[in-house]
Interface confidence: low
Amino acid sequence: VKVLHEPSCFSDYISTSVCQWKMDHPTNCSAELRLSYQLDFMGSENHTCVPENREDSVCVCSMPIDDAVEADVYQLDLWAGQQLLWSGSFQPSKHVKPRTPGNLTVHPNISHTWLLMWTNPYPTENHLHSELTYMVNVSNDNDPEDFKVYNVTYMGPTLRLAASTLKSGASYSARVRAWAQTYNSTWSDWSPSTTWLNYYEPWEQH
């Protein structure tokens, strides 16, 4: 039993870290493997994560990690029974992947604009709440070449979109993802898409 691609881990820096790795052959991850993790502080407990299959040879482990501190380092050990396959460390604050923004909605707004709104995935008391910037992707459902990308670098999780910048009568989809600049994070996963019809004359129809 060998690890082909060693574990790559990311933290949402609030409650969960996820590690993913690839084995050298199809593996029943939950039956054959265990990932142990322990905070590198005295008195911390050793925890065990039971991995799940993402694909035939790809395993994923989701580890509940409460109250991450910037200096936290976790010792990770990947076991196949009594055999240690891999050992490494992981610092959640250095490998942040933000939670996915939620509840993306589109509303007609004044002056022939669409108002896109979504929810910040972090509670207000969380450090990442005020650190997130967003990318919004707007695409024409029937024309792959008709798409726009908007960077939202201000605090509010909203985007105003002039209806005139989109083709009239076309169906558009939007999705949003988040990034935490201070933590040099990766991008979050994309939110589920929301779709609307860009009719804007007369506006009263909306």
């Epitope: 609030i14 409650s15 969960t16 502080f41 005295m42 008195g43 911390s44 407990e45 925890h47 509940p64 409460d66 109250d67 991450a68 501190v69 910037e70 200096a71 509670p123 008391e125 969380n126 450090h127």
Partner: antibody, heavy 119, light 107 residues
Framework: QIQLIQSGPELKKPGETVKISCKAS????????MSWVKQAPGKGLKWMGW????????TYADDFKGRFAFSLETSASTAYLQINNLKNEDTASYFC????????????WGQGTLVTVSA | DIVMTQSHKFMSTSVGDRVSITCKAS??????VAWYQQKPGQSPKLLIY???YRYTGVPDRFTGSGSGTDFTFTITSVQTEDLAVYYC?????????FGGGTKLEIK
């Protein structure tokens, strides 16, 4: 706003059991760990341990292993402290305290529950 | 267990004065120290976390410093409402431990 509301004062006899509740509101309960802290009358603060509201795993300080139990009712955003076989030295105020995110300071505290153990 | 020692049980000061409360850890706890204020009949309140960071809404007259084993909590200009007991606490390793507390009295 964020609140931790604890159950009311208790008067118990030695050998009895008490169960204190701590109801959280104003935030996602499973996001932050919950600690329990004891304060005997006129004395300082003593950390009893904590429970991960995400995984439900409790951690107890040595002095609080055995007769003390932390539990959760996640659907009700409530943490519990149960003390079995009460002793006179258990007379104290007990606080639940929610962890912070950035550090392991205790950011929000319940109002405290006074447990009096007397024959 | 890590022992947190606050050498002064009581400190007396006047309004407008600068006062510093010290806390010593029995071993290196890097910067994993918090400071709390407990007024009579109330729950403790977090003032400082990670040794030097003011918690949300805490007035800037409260400051914290230190690392390793020696930590200091300072009120730069004492107000009458600062009458309270102040506790340090380490969260470097479990069991998390508090200092014995320092009662600040206003002259």
């Amino acid at each position: 706003q964020i609140q931790l509301i604890q159950s009311g004062p208790e008067l118990k006899k030695p050998g009895e059991t008490v169960k204190i509740s701590c109801k959280a509101s104003g935030y996602t309960f499973t996001t932050f760990g919950m600690s329990w802290v004891k304060q005997a009358p006129g004395k300082g603060l003593k950390w009893m341990g904590w429970i991960s509201t995400y995984s439900g795993v409790p951690t107890y300080a040595d002095d609080f292993k055995g007769r003390f139990a932390f539990s959760l009712e996640t659907s009700a955003s409530t943490a519990y402290l149960q003390i079995n076989n009460l002793k006179n030295e258990d007379t104290a105020s007990y606080f639940c305290a929610r962890h912070t995110f950035q550090s392991r300071g205790l950011a929000y505290w319940g109002q405290g529950t006074l447990v009096t153990v007397s024959a | 267990d890590i022992v947190m020692t606050q050498s002064h049980k009581f400190m007396s000061t006047s309004v407008g004065d600068r006062v510093s409360i010290t806390c010593k850890a029995s071993q290196d706890v890097i910067t994993t120290v918090a400071w709390y204020q407990q007024k009579p009949g109330q729950s403790p309140k977090l003032l400082i976390y990670s040794a030097s960071y003011r918690y949300t809404g805490v007035p800037d007259r409260f400051t914290g410093s230190g690392s390793g084993t020696d930590f200091t909590f300072t009120i730069t200009s004492v107000q009458t409402e600062d009458l309270a007991v102040y506790y340090c606490q380490q969260h470097y390793s479990t069991p998390w431990t508090f200092g014995g507390g320092t009662k600040l009295e206003i002259k």
